[in-house]
């Protein structure tokens, strides 16, 4: 085959080699860029910057080699469009530093930086950590800082990510309140900071204020949906990024729903309870307190991480006709009480009018009028019966 006269020539089915001296000063408009998985660049003294726009359209790129060239600066977001990049060789260039942001989000199996005039500073603390932790083949390169000795010996005591403190209100927060959060940022070389509010949606009206080193956030007219939602403050410096998440507890009264009993490995009376703080629960059976046992007990489902509502069952492991009756769930927190009732019939009485039947659990009378509070919507409360042959 005739030698390729171009600056860049195909190499294999999806590779490109650019080795003709001084032919490139940027990576724009590389031929067949969208399908490239491998790009090898050498002897390009005029290629001094690598930026976001240079690698746009190289979404399939896995291996990138730029060696023996004039690379001085790699932008922090240079590899944003090459998420599959796994091998990066930038050896024998003019790089003095490389931001931690440049490699963030990539799963690099190999990073080669030998032969660069690196300048030891906190900005290379991340690279020193890679060396310590044996990542990306960095330890084998025994990287040196220009005129300063091995990277491994760089003092790092003062090289910390920012420190964040988020102040939340001590007092109880009620629905409709305005809440002011403040994020205090400390540390050297602070670059950027902000709030992540993706979980909030319709939970409040958001107003940001202030800037480094003190960021303010007002959550106006909060709703109960704000509970269990993360409000995150973040800050970055040349060493790395720090995040702190807080949650604002918005108080609201207890509510409860009961549903028709279902047979699920024995029996379950399903319920849902909500409220902040989490309400305490009590069951009544035919108006008397039901003391829970290993055969009649409350069992909660795994809670969703981002909501206050809890779902569960009153488990009746072996109900018979003596368990037929009216079940009431009482829920209470400092902001209100609620109750819901349902009739359940598990089995016909095979010993009709038999006074010998034991009471299955210990009961104590309760003043049911004490469960005052707003009425709660009750669903599926039609009584039902199931006949089961005994024996």
């Amino acid at each position: 085959a005739a030698p390729c006269p171009d600056a860049c020539c195909p190499h294999g089915s999806s590779g490109l080699r650019c080795t003709r001296d001084g032919a490139l000063d940027s990576l724009h408009h590389l031929p067949g860029a969208e399908n490239l998985t491998e790009l090898y660049i050498e002897n390009q003294q005029h290629l001094q910057h690598l930026e976001l726009r240079d690698l746009r359209g190289l979404g399939e790129l896995r291996n990138l080699t730029i060696v023996k060239s004039g690379l001085r600066f790699v932008a922090p977001d240079a590899f944003h469009f090459t998420p599959r990049l796994s091998r990066l060789n930038l050896s024998f260039n003019a790089l003095e530093s490389l931001s931690w942001k440049t490699v963030q989000g990539l799963s690099l199996q190999e990073l080669v930086l030998s032969g660069n005039p690196l300048h030891c500073s906190c900005a290379l603390r991340w690279l020193q950590r890679w060396e310590e932790e044996g990542l990306g083949g960095v330890p084998e390169q025994k990287l040196q800082c220009h005129g300063q000795g091995p990277l491994a010996h760089m003092p790092n005591a003062s090289c910390g990510v920012p420190t964040l403190k988020v102040q939340v209100p001590n007092a109880s927060v009620d629905v409709g309140d305005d809440v002011l959060l403040r994020c205090q940022v400390e540390g050297r070389g602070l670059e950027q900071a902000g709030w992540i509010l993706t979980e909030l949606e319709q939970s409040a009206t958001v107003m940001k204020s202030g800037g480094l080193p003190s960021l303010g956030l007002t959550l106006a007219n909060v709703t109960s949906d704000l509970n269990r939602k993360n409000v995150t403050c973040w800050a970055e410096n040349d060493v790395g990024r720090a995040e702190v998440s807080v949650q604002v507890n918005v108080s609201f009264p207890a509510s409860v729903q009961l549903h028709t009993a279902v047979e699920m490995h024995h029996w379950c009376i399903p319920f849902s309870v909500d409220g902040q703080p989490a309400p305490s629960l009590r069951w009544l059976f035919n108006g008397s307190v039901l003391n829970e046992t290993s055969f009649i007990f409350t069992e909660f489902l795994e809670p969703a991480a981002n909501e206050t509502v809890r779902h569960g069952c009153l488990r009746l492991n072996q109900p018979t006709h003596v368990n037929n009756g009216n079940y009431t769930l009482l829920a209470a927190n400092p902001f209100g009480q609620a109750s819901a009732s349902i009739m359940a019939a598990f089995m016909d009485n095979p010993f009709e009018f038999n006074p010998e039947d034991p009471i299955p659990v210990s009961f104590s009378p309760v003043d049911t009028n004490s469960t005052s509070g707003d009425p709660v919507e009750k669903k599926d409360e039609t009584p039902f019966g199931v006949s089961v042959a005994v024996g």
């Epitope: 024995h266 829970e292 055969f295 488990r315 034991p358």
Partner: antibody
Framework: QVQLVQSGAEVKKPGASVKVSCKSS????????MHWVRQAPGQGLEWMGE????????NYNEKFKNRVTMTVDISISTAYMELSRLRSDDTAVYYC??????????WGQGTTVTVSS | DVQLTQSPSSLSASVGDRVTITCSAS?????MHWYQQKPGKAPKRLIY???KLASGVPSRFSGSGSGTDYTLTISSLQPEDFATYFC?????????FGQGTRLEIK
């Protein structure tokens, strides 16, 4: 697999207390009730009480109510049964057993407690 | 308390025999459960919810009954079946066991 491993044999004097442990593994400790059952030499099984690790709810057999205390440490998936003011007729093998939807599915190997002056 | 009375208290039988143990409750219970215990060992769940076989239990074991009267049947005794059997109720506190039926080789 599910295992309930109990603490070793104890010899106690009358009037003393004994605390037996039952370490669970192989299942979610907080989802199951733990029962304590004892068996005197050559005798039948006697239920002492039960505890629900999820909320530390306990039910005791009235016979032992003033002398028995059942507790759990969910951080190490362990249940405890302490019996105080021991008498010679408390000499027995003490078992833990777990239940959720069915009774006493799995049992510990037993802990022999001897009360003797 | 619900008292459970097993009969017989002890029983001699031969390999291959059909054996029946009964458990009578002082008041109605919804279900009965049965355990097998061998000397020096913890009890092992045999039958639960009156008639369900616990995992790994041979089909020669069966249970039946309702109300106050329940039965454990072994259709054809095997050498490993010689042990003590207990019934138990799980319907009211305190949970109670029968006094046991000792099954020995004739």
């Amino acid at each position: 697999q599910v295992q309930l491993v109990q603490s070793g044999a104890e010899v106690k004097k009358p009037g003393a207390s004994v605390k037996v442990s039952c370490k669970s593994s192989g299942y979610t400790f907080t989802n199951y009730w733990m029962h304590w059952v004892r068996q005197a030499p050559g005798q039948g099984l006697e239920w002492m009480g039960e505890i629900y690790p999820n909320n530390a709810r306990v039910n005791y057999n009235e016979k032992f109510k003033n002398r028995v205390t059942m507790t759990v440490d969910i951080s190490i998936s362990t249940a405890y049964m302490e019996l105080s003011r021991l008498r010679s007729d408390d000499t027995a093998v003490y078992y833990c057993a777990r239940s959720r939807y069915d009774p006493m599915e799995d049992w510990g190997q037993g802990t022999t407690v001897t009360v003797s002056s | 308390d619900v008292q459970l009375t097993q009969s017989p208290s002890s029983l001699s039988a031969s390999v291959g025999d059909r054996v029946t143990i009964t458990c009578s409750a002082s008041s109605s219970v919804g279900y009965m459960h049965w355990y097998q215990q061998k000397p020096g060992k913890a009890p092992k769940r045999l039958i639960y919810d009156t008639s369900k076989l616990a995992s790994g239990v041979p089909s020669r074991f069966s249970g039946s009954g309702s109300g106050t009267d329940y039965t454990l049947t072994i259709s054809s005794l095997q050498p490993e079946d010689f042990a003590t059997y207990f019934c138990q109720q799980w319907s009211s506190i305190p949970l109670t066991f029968g006094q046991g039926t000792r099954l020995e080789i004739k």
